[in-house]
C-alpha cells in the first residue's frame, strides 16, 4: 500500500499475539532509523501472504524471535 509520508513507519497497530513459526513465510525486523524512530517487526504469513505487525516489547514476540533465530542458525552451515 503506497503511502506518501514524512515519517515512514509502517505499523498503525501492533499485536502481542505470537505467530506459529511454521506458518511464517517471512519475518522482517526493521530497526529504528531517521525515517521511523521505532523498531518494527512485520510477519508475512504463508496463508494469503497476510502481513502482521508485531509488538517488539511483547514477551511472546521476543520468544518468537529467539525461536526463529535459533532455527536460522541451525540451517546455516
Amino acid at each position: 500500500v503506497p503511502l506518501s509520508r514524512t515519517v515512514r513507519c509502517t505499523c498503525i497497530s501492533i499485536s502481542n499475539q505470537p505467530v506459529n513459526p511454521r506458518s511464517l513465510e517471512k519475518l522482517e525486523i526493521i530497526p529504528a532509523s531517521q525515517f521511523c524512530p521505532r523498531v518494527e517487526i512485520i510477519a508475512t504469513m504463508k496463508k494469503k501472504g497476510e502481513k502482521r505487525c508485531l509488538n517488539p516489547e511483547s514477551k511472546a514476540i521476543k520468544n518468537l524471535l529467539k525461536a526463529v533465530s535459533k532455527e536460522m542458525s541451525k540451517r546455516s552451515p
Epitope: C9, I12, S13, S15
Partner: antibody, heavy 123, light 107 residues
Amino acid sequence: QVQLVESGGGVVQPGRSLRLSCAASGFTFSNSGMHWVRQAPGKGLEWVAVIDYDGIIQYYADSVKGRFTISRDNSKNTLYLQINSLRAEDTAVYYCATERGTHYYGSGSFDYWGQGTLVTVSS
Amino acid sequence: DIQMTQSPSSLSASVGDRVTITCRASQGISSWLAWYQQKPEKAPKSLIYAASSLQSGVPSRFSGSGSGTDFTLTISSLQPEDFATYYCQQYNSYPPTFGGGTKVEIK
C-alpha cells in the same frame, strides 16, 4: 468488553473550535490504531483521521486537513480530535473506532465503534 | 481515492428471504473489504472483514464473498433484527472509503 465513549460534542458557531474525546477500555489501547469517522445527518459514513498506536503517524481526510488534529494519551487510554475553524459541513455525529490489530500499514477495518457525539455547527 | 459503489441503495424484503447486497470498488482492493450494519440512531457494527471473515459474535446467516473489485454481502435468511442500513468499506489504501449504504426495509 470493549468500550469507547465519545464526549465533547455540542452546538458551536462557525469558525469556533471544539475538542472531542474518546475514552477507551476493555482492550490494549496502546497497541491499537484509532480512527475518527463522521456521519452527517441522514448521510453515509466518512472517514476523518487515524493515529497509530504510539502517536507517531497521523493521516487525515482531505476535507479536514489543516483544521483537524488527532492525538492520543496512552496513559489515559484516551483519543482526541481537535477541530478548528468549524464549518456548517462539519455538522455530524463523530465516532471513534478501533482498527483490527494486525493489519499491516493500516488503514484497517473498524472492529469497535463508540456511540458517537453530535457536533452541530450553527450561527 | 478509491470509490465504492453499493447496490441497490434500498431494498424491501420479508423475514426469511435471502438478501444480497453488492459493492464495487473503482480499482482492485484485493480482499481488503469490510461490511457494517447500522440501525437508526446507533453506531455501526462490524459484520465482516477481509471480504469473507465473520466478526466474532456475528450470526452465521451473514456471509461475504469476492475479491479484486466485486464483493457481495449475503443474508441467508433475513431476521427481524436485520432490518438496517449496510455499508461496505475498503481498506486497501488511504483514505479508507465507504459505499453509500443499502437500506434493508420490511416489505
